[in-house]
Amino acid sequence: QAAPFPELCSYTWEAVDTKNNVLYKINICGSVDIVQCGPSSAVCEHDLKTRTYHSVGDSVLRSATRSLLEFNTTVSCDQQGTNHRVQSSIAFLCGKTLGTPEFVTATECVHYFEWRTTAACKKDIFKANKEVPCYVFDEELRKHDLNPLIKLSGAYLVDDSDPDTSLFINVCRDIDTLRDPGSQLRACPPGTAACLVRGHQAFDVGQPRDGLKVVRKDRLVLSYVREEAGKLDFCDGHSPAVTITFVCPSERREGTIPKLTAKSNCRYEIEWITEYACHRDYLESKTCSLSGEQQDVSIDLTPLAQSGGSSYISDGKEYLFYLNVCGETEIQFCNKKQAAVCQVKKSDTSQVKAAGRYHNQTLRYSDGDLTLIYFGGDECSSGFQRMSVINFECNKTAGNDGKGTPVFTGEVDCTYFFTWDTEYACVHHHHHH
């Protein structure tokens, strides 16, 4: 039986049940390399409290549909008096990066995971030439996730004192230049994740090979190597390579530019101080507030919730968007869709789509940007579920009693972008981390 998601086959993936201190290792095409789980385990559970290992999914006992992968075992379990077998169930949804398997819940018999990934899309529009896992768990099982830094189009410029060259990088995947008609970036070879431009020539100096690694609690490392044979004439016989070290800052700060810290014979060392390198709980919340010792900030957007059936309205030329954030009030146009953002076609108001649901909410504050994300909306033709990204700006003089109003700024591949100036986005910092 052919592997259902070949792009995900090259790696052993990890997921964590934080509540129970359990680490899962997942290999969807073969078996994980953990002796304690046996030779054919596809999903291996490591209980860190009891220091025990169990296989909860066997690679031989795999069944697959387009959106669901199940691994059974021969181990019996008792579920409400009936004799079942322990199994793992992975639900796949279309995403814009390779993504990460997320632990959802576990019963006595079934371990449930969800995975938003390019591998599950109906069309190839989000697929990279080359992409590697872009997250890692530290020794305390805290997740560090650089997926938000991955550029689907374009690149980051590395700060370098050399005026004659420009070094461009992407994070965990190759640089897509197809949407840029005229810049230097267009000359970069396909597949490169680190592109060096000298004059009118562009060179591949690194492609992703291995996933993100953690070297210390707040330092993550990504390594790119040039796969192609044949040395570059300016590298003195060496093969080019790029090492990017992502550093979680010691306190809250604005984002910084990736900086070249060393360069020798086409070996480039880059340091990037970014809060995305910090553990995810430091940056994100499933509610509309971020506060407490863990986050170093106090943010509360809950006053933006609308009551009594009213919604914020944002004009998107062809569409009207109705938004009701930080609550669970149904938007009238999007009745029974559980939408936080509802898209209505002006020319035909019967065409209504959920552009993100209120129970699929993430508030993120990282590198000085405050963003509220709603995902899991109605599917587009690619299979990607519509989502909305609201970028907040602090404005102490915002209208509407300080609440302000969301402004639609554009759409890319079924992701809808808004900006929102409001006094409730003014962040209060506590200075310790």
Epitope: A155, S166, T177, S183
Partner: nanobody, 123 residues
Framework: DVQLVESGGGLVQPGGSLRLSCAAS????????WGWFRQAPGKEREFVAA????????SYADSVKGRFTISRDNAKNTIYLQMNSLRPEDTAVYYC????????????????WGQGTLVTVSS
């Protein structure tokens, strides 16, 4: 691709003000950086200011810091350059540009350009 059209240039006295506008059309969200550049006669094109579309993060050339302000109106897909305390050395053709490269001020990293609008500062 992104199409950019500048307006608002003209003749102004030293110490005066002007506001340039740049209207963007096309798939504007595929570009992350919006910049203003200028080119004086016989000189290289130089960076003036930049802003990211998805947030209000800005950067400025040292020569215009404190005098010029870049801003955007997302509802109108328009980028502005408010120029105060203008000096004769600010005389140039001002260009609006868009880039898919983050953190850059280098004109060669900007792939889409407007036609430019002339600003003359003279008494």
């Amino acid at each position: 691709d992104v199409q950019l059209v500048e307006s608002g240039g003209g003749l102004v006295q030293p110490g005066g003000s002007l506001r340039l506008s740049c209207a963007a059309s096309g798939r504007t969200f595929n570009t992350y950086n919006w910049g203003w550049f200028r080119q004086a006669p016989g000189k290289e094109r130089e960076f003036v200011a930049a802003i990211r579309w998805s947030s209000s993060k800005t950067s400025y050339a040292d020569s215009v810091k404190g005098r010029f302000t870049i801003s955007r109106d997302n509802a109108k897909n328009t980028i502005y350059l408010q120029m105060n305390s203008l000096r004769p050395e600010d005389t140039a053709v001002y260009y609006c540009a868009a880039s898919i490269v983050d953190f850059t001020t280098n004109p060669s990293h900007f792939g889409s350009w407007g036609q430019g609008t002339l600003v003359t500062v003279s008494s």
